[in-house]
Interface confidence: medium
């Protein structure tokens, strides 16, 4: 015997207290898929949070992040402070890479210079904060 | 126990206004996300405008933006839908409504009394 609920669409939910009939998700919720007894609650991009797509009754909600401050995570979970090229992002905010080490983005770590030698080569152009060396014959 | 009695409905020619009540007992409005929904004839329901986050935004639907105002009375325990500028596809059973919201997340409504008949003729 086929569920009754099934035949509710996305953007509904199936109201158990009147007979299985199909509602529209109450505002500030969305239901994605069909056949669902409730629908979920819509994300609120809050704070350094900042809307990227509105939640409709079949879509959530997607976030990014305001000016200064980038992604990380699965759906944007998580803002991570930017900092300049040449530093990276420390417990103590934005610190400037070692000597020996550069980093090109306004995200992730400093790594180090390539070692030009390893691959029988020399330093054609110095690495800086902010960029790598360039190997030459 | 949660009771909702609409009120306020009837005749109206096209271009009129009404104002439909909403007497909540059994819960504290103020404390509670409600609403107005509707079901024109031989249609499914459609929310027509809320008071979400204890007041602290508005939700109307794109068909009665800037016709329909929702308002409430603390005091009263009372729930209002200001309609102004009505069209006939405005005609149908309007009922008060109460958000439900699920452990684990999920959201449903409430909706107990018997609405109230909107027609909207010439």
């Known amino acids: 015997l086929q569920d009754p609920c099934s035949n509710c669409p996305a953007g509904t939910f199936c109201d158990n207290n009147r007979n299985q009939i199909c509602s529209p998700c109450p505002p500030n919720s969305f239901s994605s898929a069909g056949g669902q007894r409730t629908c979920d609650i819509c994300r609120q991009c809050k704070g350094v949070f900042r809307t990227r797509k509105e939640c409709s009754s079949t879509s959530n909600a997607e976030c990014d992040c305001t000016p200064g401050f980038h992604c990380l995570g699965a759906g944007c979970s998580m803002c991570e402070q930017d900092c300049k090229q040449g530093q990276e992002l420390t417990k103590k905010g934005c610190k400037d890479c070692c000597f020996g080490t550069f980093n090109d983005q306004k995200r992730g770590i400093c790594r180090p210079w390539t070692n030009c030698s390893l691959d029988g080569k020399s330093v054609l152009v110095n690495g800086t904060k902010e960029r790598d060396v360039v190997c030459g014959p | 126990e949660v009771q909702l009695l609409e009120s306020g409905g009837g005749l109206v020619q096209p271009g009129g206004s009404l104002r439909l009540s909403c007497a909540a007992s059994g819960f504290t409005l103020s404390a509670e996300d409600v609403g107005w929904v509707r079901q024109a004839p031989g249609k499914g329901l459609e929310w027509v405008s809320a008071?979400?986050?204890?007041?602290?935004?508005?939700y109307y639907a794109e068909s009665v933006k800037g016709r329909f105002t929702i308002s409430r009375d603390n005091a009263k325990n009372t729930l209002y839908l200001q309609m102004s500028s009505l069209r006939a596809e405005d005609t149908a059973v309007y009922y008060c409504?109460?958000?439900?919201?699920?452990?684990?997340?999920?959201?449903?409504?409430?909706?107990r009394g018997q609405g109230t008949q909107v027609t909207v003729s010439s």
């Open positions: 409504a109460r958000v439900v919201y699920h452990a684990g997340g999920g959201v449903t409504y409430d909706y």
């Open positions: 008071i979400l986050d204890s007041g602290g935004s508005t």
